[in-house]
Interface confidence: medium
C-alpha cells in the first residue's frame, strides 16, 4: 500500500471549503479499508483530534467541532480518500494526516500529510490621529485591523487629486503609521487607510483638519 505525495500545504479563506487530498494505491481489494483522518491543530499542538473515520464500510464522526462540516469527497470505499471541510474556521488551521490501512496489503507508506492554513481578510481598520493638530506640529496617523491572516499591510493615501501623502510624511506599511512633520493648512484633508492581505482589503477614513492660530487682538 502506498499513499501518494500530497501538496505540502493548502490555504483557504475562512468560511470557504477546503479539500484535503489523500490518494493511495493498493494490491488488495477494498473490503477491509480503514481510513482515519487526524489533525494536529496549530492552536493546540499537544491535542491531536480525529476528523473523520471510515471503518468496516461505515463512516464515523470525529471531534464535535467537525460534525456536519466534514465528509469524503467521493463515494467510499475508494482509493481517493480525500476529505472536504465546509465553512472553515480559524481553529481548523493545522497539520492533517490521513492514515490508510487495507488488509492484507501491508508495508509501504500509509500516511499522507497536508497542512491547512485558514486565511482571514483584514477586519475594518481603526483610524486615529495622535498628536496636536496645531499648525507646525507633528502628527501620527494610526491604522490597525484587529483581524487578518496573513498579517495585513497598511497603505495610506490622501483623497485629493494627487493621492500623495504630504512631502513631510513617512509611511510604515507594516505598522500602519504615517508620521507627518511640521503640518500646515495644506496638510488638511481626508485620508484613507487600506488594510490588505492576500485575500482581502478593508478601509477607514480620517479627516485631518490643521488648526491655524487665531490672530490676537492687541488692545
Amino acid at each position: 500500500l502506498e499513499v501518494s505525495e500530497s501538496p505540502g500545504s493548502i490555504q483557504v479563506a475562512r468560511g470557504q471549503t477546503a479539500v484535503l487530498p489523500c490518494t493511495f494505491t493498493t494490491s488488495a481489494a477494498l473490503i477491509n479499508l480503514n481510513v482515519i483522518w487526524m489533525v494536529t491543530p496549530l492552536s493546540n499542538a499537544n491535542q491531536p483530534e480525529q476528523v473523520i473515520l471510515y471503518q468496516g464500510g461505515q463512516m464515523f464522526d470525529g471531534a464535535p467541532r467537525f460534525h456536519g462540516r466534514v465528509g469524503f469527497t467521493g463515494t467510499m470505499p475508494a482509493t481517493n480518500v480525500s476529505v472536504f471541510i465546509n465553512n472553515t474556521q480559524l481553529s481548523d488551521t493545522g497539520t492533517y494526516q490521513c492514515l490508510v490501512n487495507n488488509l492484507p496489503d501491508i508495508g509501504g507508506r500509509n500516511i499522507g500529510v497536508t497542512g491547512l492554513t485558514v486565511l482571514v481578510p483584514p477586519s475594518a481598520p481603526h483610524c486615529q490621529i495622535q498628536g496636536s493638530q496645531d499648525i507646525g506640529s507633528d502628527v501620527i496617523l494610526l491604522c490597525s485591523s484587529e483581524e487578518g491572516i496573513p498579517r495585513p499591510t497598511y497603505l495610506w493615501e490622501k483623497l485629493d487629486n494627487t493621492l500623495k501623502l504630504p512631502p513631510t510624511a513617512t509611511q510604515d506599511q507594516v505598522q500602519g503609521t504615517v508620521t507627518i512633520r511640521n503640518i500646515s493648512t495644506l496638510t488638511s484633508g481626508l485620508y484613507q487607510c487600506v488594510a490588505s492581505n492576500a485575500i482581502g482589503t478593508s478601509t477607514c477614513l480620517l479627516d485631518l483638519q490643521v488648526i491655524s492660530p487665531q490672530p490676537r487682538n492687541i488692545g
Partner: antibody, heavy 123, light 108 residues
Framework: EVQLVESGGGLVKPGGSLRLSCAAS????????MSWVRQAPGKGLEWVGR??????????DYAAPVKGRFTISRDDSKNTLYLQMNSLKTEDTAVYYC??????????????WGQGTLVTVSS | SYELTQPPSVSVSPGQTASITCSGD??????ASWYQQKPGQSPVLVIY???KRPSGIPERFSGSNSGNTATLTISGTQAEDEADYYC???????????FGGGTKLTVL
C-alpha cells in the same frame, strides 16, 4: 490562489450589446475594488472603469470614451464582476481584462489580472 | 485629458541595467505604477505607489518618480525580462488609471 476568469466575449455588430463576466476566486471578493481594462489588438492598455466594494459605497467610475454606454456591476454572492456594454462601436474592439485593485484604495495598482476575453465589434 | 509618454522601445544587454521612462505633466505629484506584459499574456503589476514592489516581484525591479518623470529600473536584466512595460498614473481620485503607450524592452 487568487484567480480571475473572464467570459462572454465574442463578435457583435455595431450598436449591439454584450455582457462580460469575471469570476473571482481565492480572495474575499466582496471586500475588493475591481476594475476593467481593455487592450485593442496590437495596442496599449486603456482603463475602462472601476467599482468599489459595497462597504466602501459600491460606486462606479468610468473612462470618458465609455461613460454612458458601459455599466460595471457586481454580485458578491456569486463572486462575479460584470461589464454591460451597450451601443458598441468598432473602436470598442479589444481584449477586455478584469483586475483587482491590489491594495485597495486608488494607488495600489491592479493585481492580478484575468486572462482576458476578446470582444470584436464588426458588421 | 492627462497623457503619459513612454519611449516605444529600449534595448539592453543581459546583466546590464535597463531604465524605462514615463513622462507626464507634474507626474511626480501623482503615484505611478508599472506593469509587465509578455506576448500572449496578461499584464502583471511590478511596481505600485512609485517604488513599492508587490510580493513575488524580484528585487531587481525598482521605481522612482519625481518632477515630470517616473522611471522603472531593472538591474541585472535577464532574458525573461523581455516584455512590454506600461506605466500608469492614478490621475484624479475618480480616474483609477491612465496608461502610457508602452515600451518594448529587448534583451539583446
Amino acid at each position: 490562489e487568487v484567480q480571475l476568469v473572464e467570459s462572454g466575449g465574442g463578435l457583435v455588430k455595431p450598436g449591439g450589446s454584450l455582457r462580460l463576466s469575471c469570476a473571482a476566486s481565492g480572495f474575499t471578493f466582496s471586500n475588493a475594488w475591481m476594475s476593467w481594462v481593455r487592450q485593442a489588438p496590437g495596442k496599449g492598455l486603456e482603463w475602462v472603469g472601476r467599482i468599489k466594494s459595497k462597504t466602501d459605497g459600491g460606486t462606479t467610475d468610468y473612462a470618458a470614451p465609455v461613460k454612458g454606454r458601459f455599466t460595471i456591476s457586481r454580485d458578491d454572492s456569486k463572486n462575479t464582476l460584470y461589464l454591460q456594454m451597450n451601443s458598441l462601436k468598432t473602436e470598442d474592439t479589444a481584449v477586455y481584462y478584469c483586475a483587482r485593485v491590489a491594495h485597495g484604495g486608488y494607488s495600489g495598482g491592479l493585481d492580478p489580472w484575468g486572462q482576458g476575453t476578446l470582444v470584436t465589434v464588426s458588421s | 485629458s492627462y497623457e503619459l509618454t513612454q519611449p516605444p522601445s529600449v534595448s539592453v544587454s543581459p546583466g546590464q541595467t535597463a531604465s524605462i521612462t514615463c513622462s507626464g505633466d507634474k507626474l511626480g505629484d501623482k503615484y505611478a505604477s508599472w506593469y509587465q506584459q509578455k506576448p500572449g499574456q496578461s499584464p502583471v503589476l511590478v511596481i505600485y505607489q512609485d517604488s513599492k514592489r508587490p510580493s513575488g516581484i524580484p528585487e531587481r525591479f525598482s521605481g522612482s518618480n519625481s518632477g515630470n518623470t517616473a522611471t522603472l529600473t531593472i538591474s541585472g536584466t535577464q532574458a525573461e525580462d523581455e516584455a512590454d512595460y506600461y506605466c500608469s498614473s492614478t490621475g484624479t481620485a475618480h480616474t483609477l488609471a491612465v496608461f502610457g503607450g508602452g515600451t518594448k524592452l529587448t534583451v539583446l
